[in-house]
Amino acid sequence: APTSSSTKKTQLQLEHLLLDLQMILNGINNYKNPKLTRMLTFKFYMPKKATELKHLQCLEEELKPLEEVLNLAQSKNFHLRPRDLISNINVIVLELKGSETTFMCEYADETATIVEFLNRWITFCQSIISTLT
C-alpha cells in the first residue's frame, strides 16, 4: 500500500506534469503567428483509456512528436524551450508510471490536434490529483 510520503511525491509529480502541460497550452493559445495554423495540422494519438498512472505510457510515446511540433513555435514570444521541456516531462512520466512498466498503450481511432491532445492529458492529471487530494 502506498505510504503518505509516496502519495505526496506522486501528487507533487502530477502537479509538475499538469503545470508543464498547462504552460505549453498557454504558450500555444498566446501564439499569434501563421505557424499556429501549421501546428494545428499535426495529428496526435489519443489514449483509448486514461484513468491510471500506467496509461501515461501513451503520453510518453507522443512526447517526441510533441517536441517536433513545439520546435515550430520557436520565437521571442514563445518561452518554452522544447528540448528542456520535453526532457523534464519525460522524467516525470517515467517516475510516475514506473520505468519497468510493460503496459501496451491502446490508442483511440480518432487523432487529435495539439490543443485537444494537451487538454486530454491536463484532464487526466487533474482527475488523478483530485483523487489524491
Epitope: 507533487l12 503545470l19 498547462q22 498557454n26 493559445n29 518561452h79 487533474q126 487530494t133
Partner: antibody
Framework: QVQLVQSGAEVKKPGASVKVSCKAS????????MHWVRQAPGQGLEWMGI????????SYALKFQGRVTMTRDTSTSTVYMELSSLRSEDTAVYYC??????WGQGTLVTVSS | DIQMTQSPSSLSASVGDRVTITCRAS??????LAWYQQKPGKAPKLLIY???SLDSGVPSRFSGSGSGTDFTLTISSLQPEDFATYYC?????????FGQGTKVEIK
C-alpha cells in the same frame, strides 16, 4: 520556516524596467513552481505568469507577453521578475507565490514621471 | 480566459453572523477553485483549496463548497479578525484568474 522574501520598493520612470527578486527558503526550491501576481492600488489580483524553477522555462499571461521576463537562480533559490516599458498603470504591488500557500510580502513598484 | 465573478462585491456584517460569498466561473472548472483572505497591506492568505479543503492552520469556521461553475465560501460565525477582502481563484486552466473580490466590513 517556509518563506519568500522579496526585494524592496522601487520608483521608476515611464519607459524604464524594473527587476523584482523573490528569495525562497525553508523548502526544496525546485519542488514548487513560482507564480507572480500583481495588485494595482485598490484593485484585485492579476496573474502574470509562472516559472518552472528546475528547468527555468516560463509561461506568461498574454497581457504581459513581450514585456515580462521571469528567471531563476537555483544556487541562491531566487526567482526574478523583470517588467519592461513601464507605464503608470504598472504601479502595483508585485507578489511571488510558491504553490499558492506561501506568498512573498510584496514589492511596491511605483511608475511616475 | 475563464472569468470568475464574485457576489456580493461588499457586505456589512456583525461579529457572530454567518456570512456567505459566492463565486461563479464562466465555464466548468471542476473543483479547481481556491479562496483567499487579504487584509490591507498584506499578501493574500490561502484559506480553501480544491473548492472545499481547508488549508492547514485555517479556523474551521471557514468552509468551501461547490463544483463545476458555482462555489461558495461560508464563515459560520464571523470573528473580528475576519473583516477583510476575500478572493476566489481558478487554477483549472491558464491564465489563472481571480474574482474581483468581496469586502467584508463591520456593520
Amino acid at each position: 520556516q517556509v518563506q519568500l522574501v522579496q526585494s524592496g520598493a522601487e520608483v521608476k520612470k515611464p519607459g524604464a524596467s524594473v527587476k523584482v527578486s523573490c528569495k525562497a527558503s525553508g523548502y526544496t526550491f525546485t519542488d514548487y513552481y513560482m507564480h507572480w501576481v500583481r495588485q494595482a492600488p485598490g484593485q484585485g489580483l492579476e496573474w502574470m505568469g509562472i516559472i518552472n524553477p528546475r528547468a527555468g522555462y516560463t509561461s506568461y499571461a498574454l497581457k504581459f507577453q513581450g514585456r515580462v521576463t521571469m528567471t531563476r537562480d537555483t544556487s541562491t533559490s531566487t526567482v526574478y521578475m523583470e517588467l519592461s516599458s513601464l507605464r503608470s498603470e504598472d504601479t502595483a504591488v508585485y507578489y511571488c507565490t510558491s504553490g499558492w500557500d506561501v506568498w512573498g510580502q510584496g514589492t511596491l513598484v511605483t511608475v511616475s514621471s | 480566459d475563464i472569468q470568475m465573478t464574485q457576489s456580493p462585491s461588499s457586505l456589512s456584517a456583525s461579529v457572530g453572523d454567518r456570512v456567505t460569498i459566492t463565486c461563479r466561473a464562466s465555464q466548468s472548472i471542476s473543483t479547481w477553485l481556491a479562496w483567499y483572505q487579504q487584509k490591507p497591506g498584506k499578501a493574500p492568505k490561502l484559506l480553501i483549496y480544491a473548492a472545499s479543503s481547508l488549508d492547514s492552520g485555517v479556523p474551521s469556521r471557514f468552509s468551501g463548497s461547490g463544483s463545476g461553475t458555482d462555489f461558495t465560501l461560508t464563515i459560520s460565525s464571523l470573528q473580528p479578525e475576519d473583516f477583510a477582502t476575500y478572493y476566489c481563484q481558478q487554477s483549472y486552466s491558464f491564465p489563472v484568474t481571480f474574482g474581483q473580490g468581496t469586502k467584508v466590513e463591520i456593520k
